[in-house]
């Protein structure tokens, strides 16, 4: 067995904000330290926490595709928010990818919602 | 003094499963995260999974995901490595490491798995 | 993830002679958390230095870390008989924790 220094991880990262936890648990926006005696802040713009927790390590903020804007920038306590670009949605049977929405409504069809973000045109038949 | 002492290992036929465990004295472990660390024969150190003080949050390389599990009995100071379709490239000595970020201040002397028909 | 990039590979000196080992990160990493390791033959590694520089309880003054962001390095003052041996770095900054492949320190 190696013997060490008994608590190396309670040395401070002095970048990072810190409080203890409640019940073991730490804030949206923070980690816990592997000593379970603080909780750090997560980094702004780079990761994040939504709910109280344990975690060792604050979740990774998503970036947003080519092809989708950012409609919302990562905080601390939120993810970013990706939109597809207009003219293009995801469907929710495939929501890895903004697939491009149709330009127009087949013969004998009239268009009855337009493309958005989360849906591509909507067309129904035309009444005779 | 602290101690890390690991158990389980042993020869596993490929698909086969292994708990490894690894029992330590001698600091609150229910407070500190603890990780499993790896080494392949003649290889260097590979990070294989990690768990939080209260066992709430586990973390695995993308290596391990899905067939190792990481957990932990509090109440027996004891560190557990279920290990499920093994394969020949999981030969190695697994060690038990106090834990994850900072650094790995203490060690077990690890224990030998081998992987192979 | 992070991939840290250590050399030389193998560095051959002799006792008495300064040693330094380079560890180079991918992407930045937080000094508190980059930790480098000692490893000899059929033995757990052992910490030398966590949080870039600060030496471990019971490491010598002879060892040394310093840098920041993508490169970090390990010096060794004087080479003892003892410290011939494969040293590696780990970062824990981002998720992955990942090592360093090591650095053998051999005898000339």
């Known amino acids: 067995i190696t013997r060490q220094s008994l608590d190396p991880q309670r040395r401070a990262a002095p970048q990072q904000k810190r409080s203890s936890p409640t019940e073991g648990l730490c804030p949206p926006g923070h980690h816990i330290s592997e000593d379970s005696r603080e909780c750090i802040s997560c980094k702004y713009g780079q990761d994040y926490s939504t709910h109280w927790n344990d975690f060792l390590f604050c979740l990774r903020c998503t970036k947003c595709d080519s092809g989708e804007v950012e409609v919302n920038s990562c905080t601390t306590t939120r993810n970013t928010v990706c939109q597809c670009e207009e003219g293009t949605f995801r469907e929710e049977d495939s929501p890895e990818i903004c697939r491009k929405c149709r330009t127009g409504c087949p013969r004998g069809m009239v268009k009855v919602k337009d493309c958005t973000p989360w849906s591509d045109i909507e067309c129904v038949h035309k009444e005779s | 003094e602290v101690q890390l002492l690991e158990s389980g290992g042993g020869l596993v036929q490929p698909g086969g499963s292994l708990r490894l465990s690894c029992a330590a004295s001698g600091f609150t472990f229910s407070s500190y995260a603890m990780s499993w660390v790896r080494q392949a024969p003649g290889k260097g150190l590979e990070w294989v999974s990690a768990?939080?003080?209260?066992?709430?949050?586990?973390y695995y390389a993308d290596s391990v995901k899905g067939r190792f599990t990481i957990s932990r009995d509090n109440s027996k100071n004891t560190l557990y490595l279920q290990m499920n379709s093994l394969r020949a490239e999981d030969t190695a000595v697994y060690y038990c490491a106090k834990g994850v970020r900072i650094s790995f201040d203490y060690w077990g002397q690890g224990t030998l798995v081998t992987v192979s028909s | 993830e992070i991939v840290l990039t250590q050399s030389p590979g193998t560095l051959s000196l002799s006792p008495g002679e300064r040693a330094t080992l380079s560890c180079r990160a991918s992407q930045s990493v937080s000094s508190s958390y980059l930790a480098w390791y000692q490893q000899k033959p059929g033995q757990a590694p052992r910490l030398l230095i966590y949080?870039?520089?600060s030496r471990a309880t019971g490491i010598p003054d002879r060892f040394s870390g310093s840098g920041s962001g993508t490169d970090f390095t390990l010096t060794i003052s004087r080479l003892e008989p003892e410290d011939f041996a494969v040293y590696y770095c780990?970062?824990?900054?981002?998720?992955?924790?990942?090592f360093g492949q090591g650095t053998k320190v051999e005898i000339k």
């Open positions: 949080g870039a520089s």
């Open positions: 780990q970062q824990g900054s981002n998720q992955p924790v990942t």
């Open positions: 768990i939080s003080g209260s066992g709430g949050s586990t």
